[in-house]
Amino acid sequence: QSPPGKPEIHKCRSPDKETFTCWWNPGSDGGLPTNYSLTYSKEGEKNTYECPDYKTSGPNSCFFSKQYTSIWKIYIITVNATNEMGSSTSDPLYVDVTYIVEPEPPRNLTLEVKQLKDKKTYLWVKWLPPTITDVKTGWFTMEYEIRLKSEEADEWEIHFTGHQTQFKVFDLYPGQKYLVQTRCKPDHGYWSRWGQEKSIEIPNDFTLKD
């Protein structure tokens, strides 16, 4: 039996710059029941506060609702582990909510097979930014990737589309069914998970030109 090991805050993420969550790795418990508490202060302030919500985001986490989230201030966060034998504290973590955004995936993915004048067929992939993202005002600058594969294939083919919310895929095989997904990443943030999978079959009656 011993004091707890040093916890580490290993991840903080915000879906929208309006709320955020931080997660920690507990470290060893020293063989004893161990309590964890997250405390934080904000840049330029002397007050220290305890985590407002340990439940919403699951074990070893702290959720900051709208009421507790500010993009104007850096958060200085630590986690303290305590058992009967003693306590230990994580290194302080500095968090700027602007730089931890992991958005929801893009929405309204639509797939359409089109044909050029020269009879060349392509798949037109279109989507919209995530609902919460105010892209129009420049509040978020979003980049996108799409991935697609035929049903039989093992590997996804990934295309980076920059800020475009549409993409044309050429050289697809007639009669094949293709699966498509999109994801997005804000400036200096993190990729969303891949969005809902959509599928489309390339008709056989279109002939592909070399």
Epitope: H10, Y94, H188
Partner: antibody, heavy 118, light 112 residues
């Protein structure tokens, strides 16, 4: 304790490439961006680019685009900076640096001197 | 790219006396989110740079309170209220509002 340990000094010929490594320890490697900054002898600091080790997404300073490649190996918690088509002006100390969940640098490697000379 | 201009280039200070370094940016450092990402680093002789001040005026963990930062928009100042022998080195201002991040040319602080 957070540590960034860089590879040793290198002497290179003009036109060749150099690859500098930065081994991270004391934290979850995939959680934080790693940046590369260089400093020519007696000069100021110059930001070269950054990588998110979780998915190897990179941003580069356009000045170096096409010549610099930043990579990360999650299995060894190591970031790399490769600079190609070296010229004498690339003689500098190259630093890796780590941010928090912020856009400033809290931890720095010890630096790697790269000398480009014929 | 944003050009960061520091003055003076060098500074010789008597221990216990104050020192002031100015940093001017070629464009506003106010981010679209309202924050100003102007930071100060100190590079002691033979060492890597270390963070002193982040976001204009916030001392980083472990930085003595004799260091203070101020300013807004394009004009910023680092002040050392009472210079100590351990404060010698080159001070750099840096902006991370705009990509690429850029640094000032540095101000060398020596002890008289």
């Amino acid at each position: 304790e957070v540590q960034l340990v860089q590879s040793g000094a290198e002497v290179k010929k003009p036109g060749s490439s150099v690859k500098v490594s930065c081994k991270a320890s004391g934290y979850t490697f995939t959680s934080y961006w790693i940046h590369w900054v260089r400093q020519a002898p007696g000069q100021g600091l110059e930001w070269m680019g950054e990588i998110d080790p979780s998915d190897s997404y990179t941003n580069y300073n356009q000045k170096f685009k096409g010549r610099v490649t930043i990579t990360a190996d999650k299995s060894t918690s190591t970031a790399y900076m490769e600079l190609s088509s070296l010229r004498s002006e690339d003689t500098a100390v190259y630093y890796c640096a780590r941010s928090f969940f912020t856009n400033w640098f809290a931890y720095w490697g010890q630096g790697t001197l790269v000398t480009v000379s014929s | 790219d944003v050009v960061m201009t520091q003055t003076p280039l060098s500074l010789s200070v008597t221990p216990g006396q104050p020192a002031s370094i100015s940093c001017r940016s070629s464009q506003s450092l106010v981010h679209s989110n309202g924050n100003t990402y102007l930071h100060w680093y100190l590079q002691k002789p033979g060492q890597s740079p270390q963070l002193l001040i982040y976001k204009v005026s916030n001392r980083f963990s472990g930085v003595p309170d004799r260091f203070s930062g101020s300013g807004s928009g394009t004009d910023f100042t680092l002040k050392i209220s009472r210079v100590e022998a351990e404060d010698v080195g080159v001070y750099f201002c840096s902006q991370s509002t705009h990509v690429p991040f850029t640094f000032g040319g540095g101000t060398k602080v020596e002890i008289k």
